[in-house]
């Protein structure tokens, strides 16, 4: 496929605001199963000084706890360093700030390396529109369709959103 291609303009600030987690994927299924360390859900994001700040919802003891994390900028524009359950190289794979965001992380915990991907959208009613893009990115990085978990309302801590 060939054609004209323009890279998106604008900075990280456009990612600020509310987001909803739609799907997770990993080559280590335990990480994204219920109670898995990466079974976490985005609530909102903001950007400052080139770093990404995220409020995430973590299911705990039947409730959802809101936790703030910061992904720190690196020399590469779409790569961030995140300390969460070990060290993560976090990459923004695909972004439409008004619609959806696909990220993936290379997680290093002790001597174990894992791959985790996350699809989030602005508008939950359009989540089906962006699942094919997520599946394509997952395939490209080596995650199969059967390693993708599409979340339900019950999964994603909807009741904990203000």
């Amino acid at each position: 496929q060939e054609g004209n291609h323009e890279e998106p303009q604008g900075g990280l600030e456009e990612l600020s605001g509310r987001w909803h987690s739609v799907a997770l994927a990993s080559n280590k299924s335990d990480l994204i199963k219920p109670w898995g360390h990466f079974r976490v859900f985005i609530h909102s994001m903001s950007a400052k000084d080139g770093n990404l700040h995220g409020d995430i919802l973590i299911p705990q003891d039947g409730q959802c706890e809101k936790v703030s994390l910061t992904a720190f900028k690196t020399a590469t524009s779409n790569k961030f360093d995140l300390e969460y359950w070990g060290h993560n190289d976090l990459y923004l794979a695909e972004v439409d700030p008004k619609s959806y965001l696909i990220l993936y992380m290379i997680n290093q915990y002790n001597d174990d390396t894992s791959l985790v991907a996350h699809l989030m959208v602005r508008d939950l009613s359009r989540q089906q529109d962006f699942l094919p893009a997520f599946e394509s990115v997952c395939e490209d990085i080596g995650l199969h369709k059967d390693q993708i978990v599409v979340l339900s309302d019950d999964d994603r801590c909807q009741g904990s959103r203000d």
Epitope: T76, D89, Y91, E94, I106, T113, D140
Partner: nanobody, 116 residues
Framework: AVQLVESGGGLVQPGGSLRLSCAAS????????MSWYRQAPGKEREWVAF????????NYANSVKGRFTASRDNAKNTVYLQMNSLKPEDTAVYYC?????????WGKGTLVTVSS
């Protein structure tokens, strides 16, 4: 226009090695991951390898793990696939691919034939 051009394929004996290249143009190469796929005669296209935009991490299909190595030179806008200990079942057309903000871009492929 975005362009991906593979090269380096050819005929090689079992146990031999080849290094494929994929030259990219028309986009900011260093910002994007790259993937390798292959399609054997009469079979579906299958994913082979992936390398992050920085080149710091890779992932491989089980069938090639330990034999194939992906690398990239962002100064040259080129991604490589070093293939060692080649087997007849590695015979296929090899494609590089990237995904640029919602669109898939493929090269035209380079043929690798492993035969004695």
């Amino acid at each position: 226009a975005v362009q991906l051009v593979e090269s380096g394929g050819g005929l090689v004996q079992p146990g031999g090695s080849l290094r494929l290249s994929c030259a990219a143009s028309g986009f900011t190469f260093s910002n994007y991951y790259m993937s390798w796929y292959r399609q054997a005669p009469g079979k579906e296209r299958e994913w082979v390898a992936f390398i992050t935009s920085t080149g710091s991490s890779t992932n491989y299909a089980n069938s090639v793990k330990g034999r194939f190595t992906a690398s990239r030179d962002n100064a040259k806008n080129t991604v490589y696939l070093q293939m060692n200990s080649l087997k007849p079942e590695d015979t296929a057309v090899y494609y590089c691919k990237t995904r640029l903000w919602g669109n898939d871009y493929w090269g035209k492929g380079t043929l690798v034939t492993v035969s004695s």
